[in-house]
């Protein structure tokens, strides 16, 4: 029987290799192989300061796989020098390119600075480097630009240790002075560049219509057309203040809807430091300013000021316990100032203004009191002006400012009122200043 032998066929298949990949400039390829066939892959890594880009679009990683038709599944990316782009603008400041004009690539250096005199840099020294991650970064590691904070407590006034019984203010003497119209005439003091500190009673009637408050800064004459206009974004009245029931917690903050430009006529007042009490002892001199009633019984045309000494708290409490002022309304949240002989005082229309003191260590003025209340007859002998004691409210002020933001939104929408109310009934016989 014949033997049968069949065909023996051996199939061998050689996968078509992919084109040999060339790493882009400033990049390297891994793994390096003699050839790359089906399902082989490679990755591209860029040198420090260079980033993977596919066109304009960034990639964190790149890997290509060899396909069965002998082509790579994606094109080679580039390794481009990291470009941090133009640095953010600095409000009230500027940026200088140190490495070279408009150079924004890896290791480039820029220097932020604030407008001299009226602003100071907060957070860091203003030097930023373009790092490999593509962010402008300070020596402390911050990616956000610094902040130019207004310098507070600057005054043109030559400090006199030597408004009712007062003198005329000159330009730049009280650059924190704010005139508040809309209800009755009142005052306030600028904090930072978009907050006004005032008395709760001064704006209470407008609390639900904050946008009606006509807020004027940089004015010297009450009726002058030369001033900077501001509007309220929100009003914050102390939750412990009860209108027409005593004057405890007579403090409020107004957030402006835009930051104001600081200059020699518009500068914020400083808040008191912890050590400030040492400049507000009995007989220390504070200065109150305003457009309130003068000795002639009329609202002042020109901004007036008066230098008045702090009065011993017990003496002040006693003065207001005598008829017709009985009621013991002077609390630990208040301080008193004035002359026992009378003649120098704040008065109606000065409400909400600042009683300021010079910090002898920093040579800056700070707000120690807010004009609140006093006897019916301003400057009366044996009676004193009563002021909200600001140092007691530093946590309240800082809490509101941090929670409700430093920057005015400048956006639309109606101004709002924020407060928590605890009503208590109590009679009083004193007038609001």
């Amino acid at each position: 029987m014949a033997s049968m032998t069949g065909w023996k066929i051996h199939y061998t298949s050689t996968a078509q290799p992919c084109p040999y990949p060339m790493a882009p400039p400033n990049g390297h390829l891994s793994p390096v192989q003699a050839k790359y066939i089906l399902k082989d892959s490679f990755s591209i890594f860029c040198e420090p300061g260079y980033e993977l880009l596919q066109g304009h679009l960034p990639l964190k990683s790149f890997a290509a796989v060899c396909q069965k038709d002998g082509s790579w599944d994606q094109p080679m990316p580039s390794c481009s020098i990291v470009d941090c782009g133009p640095p953010d603008d600095l409000p009230s400041g500027r940026v200088e390119y140190i490495t070279g004009p408009e150079v924004t690539t890896y290791k480039a250096v820029i220097q932020y600075s604030c407008e001299e005199t009226f602003y100071t840099m907060k957070v860091n020294d203003g030097k930023y480097v373009c790092e490999a991650d593509g962010f402008w970064t300070s020596s402390k590691g911050e990616r956000s630009p610094p902040v130019c904070e207004p310098v507070c407590g600057l005054s043109a006034r030559t400090t006199g240790g030597r408004i009712y019984g007062g003198q005329k203010a000159k330009p730049g003497d009280f650059p924190w002075q704010v005139l508040i119209l809309g209800g009755s005439t009142a005052a306030g003091a600028l904090l930072y560049d978009n907050w006004v500190l005032t008395a709760a009673h001064a704006i209470y009637e407008q609390k639900h219509d904050a946008s009606s408050l006509d807020i004027r800064l940089g004015a010297l004459k009450r009726l002058s057309p030369h001033y900077t206009q501001a509007w309220a974004e929100a009003v914050f009245i102390h939750e412990g203040y009860t209108h027409d029931a005593g004057f405890d917690n007579d403090i409020a903050l107004i957030k402006l809807n835009n930051k104001v430009v600081i200059n020699s006529n518009i500068t914020p007042i400083c808040l008191p430091r912890k050590e400030a009490e040492s400049f507000m002892r009995t007989d220390d001199i504070g200065t109150a300013s305003g457009w309130g009633l003068t000795q002639r019984g009329l609202l002042a045309r020109n901004l007036m000021y008066v230098d008045i000494p702090i009065v011993d708290h017990q003496k002040c409490t006693a003065a207001y316990e005598k008829p017709p002022y009985s009621g013991g309304s002077v609390t630990a949240n208040m301080l008193c100032a004035g002359l026992e002989s009378g003649g120098k005082d704040s008065c109606r229309g000065d409400s909400g203004g600042a009683l300021v003191f010079l910090d002898n260590e920093t040579q800056r003025w700070f707000v120690g009191g807010i004009v609140s209340w006093g006897s019916m007859n301003c400057g009366e002998a044996g009676q004193y002006g009563v002021y909200t004691k600001v140092i007691n409210y530093i946590p309240w002020i800082k809490n509101i400012i941090s929670n409700f933001g430093g920057g005015g939104s400048g956006g639309g929408g109606s101004a709002k009122f924020v407060a928590a109310w605890t009503l208590k009934a109590a009679a009083h016989h004193h007038h609001h200043h």
Epitope: H56, L57, P58, L59, D133
Partner: antibody, heavy 114, light 107 residues
Framework: QVQLQESGPGLVKPSQTLSLTCTVS?????????WNWIRQPPGKGLEWIGY???????SYNPSLKSRVTISRDTSKNQFSLKLSSVTAADTAVYYC???????WGQGTLVTVSS | DIQMTQSPSSLSASVGDRVTITCKAS??????VAWFQQKPGKAPKPLIY???YRYSGVPSRFSGSGSGTDFTLTISSLQPEDFATYFC?????????FGGGTKVEIK
Amino acid sequence: QVQLQESGPGLVKPSQTLSLTCTVSGYSITSDYAWNWIRQPPGKGLEWIGYISYSGRTSYNPSLKSRVTISRDTSKNQFSLKLSSVTAADTAVYYCARYWGDYWGQGTLVTVSS
Amino acid sequence: DIQMTQSPSSLSASVGDRVTITCKASQNVGSNVAWFQQKPGKAPKPLIYSASYRYSGVPSRFSGSGSGTDFTLTISSLQPEDFATYFCHQYNTYPLTFGGGTKVEIK
């Protein structure tokens, strides 16, 4: 499967700020790529608004740069668009998209009208 | 900004036809061009990236070519589901830009 979903108000008043959020599922926005916003006015072509990259860097169309902010919330795997001072010309379908467009959201129509 | 000029702006074709759409960039964009298909009321659907790379799941009748300033999208045999508007897109240079679109209609 990578999915993107836009959300936000469909009607915005002139001069106000348009705010939209893109929620990404199936991929972490910090893992890689650029996460874009693109818009298309009714009956018109596509316009790139800007992106936020995996590292948090942003790039904006210069024609809109002064009004645009793109940010992200990595804990929610979302990125957001804010466009301020809107006018009727900002009425469009707004899309979010990954990279140069391999994945897109379905789009959301935003009308600017009083 | 780089202008991406698409032509034609619209065309009429029949099922089975070979359709070619071109896109001209106002300056060199390398091969950083993508093509999208969009149907009314829908988001754009990606077809091609890096001028000639097809996204997975995209039928092989769609192909892209070109580099530098001249790019082409070809549909080798038009299917009923291909009637739509097609956009080119350059992602080479900031700001990213799109072509004005080509509407492919049934003849």
